[in-house]
């Protein structure tokens, strides 16, 4: 999916006003600086490029973080101020609801919504570029 | 200290697909970063190709996206280019290295491919 | 495409001398740049990260400056291992990340 023609200044205001506090939720407990934010991105389409792969694909060690407030929120944000984001999405819900049916909180997963935060961070920078 | 290693075959002819590997010691390319790769025309300067991140995320230069994949093995901590249809301007030194998908902070010692007959 | 241009192409100096080479964007990228260092048969490698941060065990006597669409890389005090080809890369400018034509510092 091509993120260009987002509305960027709607999923920011979500991202501040909910998204970030289930962030902070989900890592609670844990010190901000356990994990070292090994990617970054360049631009808010970018930015959210890499915050639906990360947030949606399962990794080693972390299955999913799909069923998780955030990332339920994150998926919202998209399909309301992404055009053509919730058609694009259908075969990949499907994926999600087979790979997990409960949630495992892993250092794994934390580390993870650890990089997840510093993405959103840098979606959220005054001067990053629009595309 | 994360080490990586490009190779494959110095000599490709036009039309084919060059294919190269890069096998990474020292860091789980499934742990963190993305895992690039760039190219060096002789004695001229730097293009990047694309990335695959720890997570799976793929990008690709525009100019270049319609010939590239780039894909992973996990098992053997190591990532993959393919270029297809190659010409001669396609000869150069091939680099792999780790990204925060933004610079490039460990490289490879490049290994160079000709496309000729 | 951002394209960079640095200068100069060529900058010829003496052990000891300062190298101030520039590289300039066809469009603001904020502080979104890097500068490389290549030697002869060898890899890049990285120095200067956000336009003016030094990446892990790059020495002093380098550092970066700039924003928007002019940048500086300075060598404070050449040493001989110094003398090399340089690039800037900006990553403003995603998926089309460009890299300059290069500047070559060498010996006089």
């Known amino acids: 999916y091509d993120f260009t023609n987002c509305d960027f200044e709607k999923i920011k205001a979500a991202y501040l006003s909910t998204i970030s506090k289930d962030l902070i939720t989900y890592m609670s407990g844990t010190k901000s600086t356990e994990f070292n934010n090994t990617v970054s991105c360049s631009n808010r389409p970018h930015c959210l490029t890499e915050i639906q792969s990360l947030t949606f694909n399962p990794t080693a060690g972390c299955a999913s973080l799909a069923k998780e407030m955030f990332a339920m929120k994150t998926k919202a944000a998209l399909a309301i101020w992404c055009p053509g984001y919730s058609e694009t999405q259908i075969n990949a819900t499907q994926a999600m609801k087979k790979a997990r049916k409960s949630k495992v909180t892993t250092n794994k997963c934390l580390e993870q919504v650890s990089q997840l935060q510093g993405l959103w961070r840098r979606f959220n920078r005054p001067l990053l570029k629009q595309q | 200290q994360v080490q990586l290693q490009e190779s494959g075959p110095g000599l490709v002819k036009p039309s084919e697909t060059l294919s190269l590997t890069c096998t990474v010691s020292g860091y789980s390319i499934s742990s963190g970063y993305g895992w690039s790769w760039i190219r060096q025309p002789p004695g001229k300067g730097l293009e990047w190709i694309g990335y695959?991140?720890?997570?799976?995320?793929?990008s690709y230069n525009p100019s270049l996206k319609s010939r590239v994949t780039i894909s992973r093995d996990t098992s053997k901590n190591q990532f993959s280019l393919k270029l297809s249809s190659v010409t001669a301007a396609d000869t150069a030194v091939y680099y792999c290295a780790r990204t925060n998908l933004l610079y490039f902070d460990s490289w490879g010692q490049g290994t160079l491919v000709t496309v000729s007959s | 495409e951002i394209v960079l241009t640095q200068s100069p192409a060529t900058l010829s100096l003496s052990p000891g001398e300062r190298a101030t080479l520039s590289c300039r964007a066809s469009q603001s990228v904020s502080n979104n740049l890097a500068w490389y260092q290549q030697k002869p048969g060898q890899a890049p490698r990285l120095l200067i990260y956000?336009?003016?941060s030094r990446a892990t065990g790059i020495p002093a006597r380098f550092s970066g400056s700039g924003s928007g669409t002019d940048f500086t890389l300075t060598i404070s005090s050449l040493e001989p291992e110094d003398f090399a080809v340089y690039y800037c890369q900006q990553y403003s400018d995603w998926p089309q990340y460009t890299f300059g034509q290069g500047t070559k510092v060498e010996i006089k």
């Open positions: 695959i991140s720890y997570y799976g995320s793929i």
């Open positions: 956000d336009a003016s």
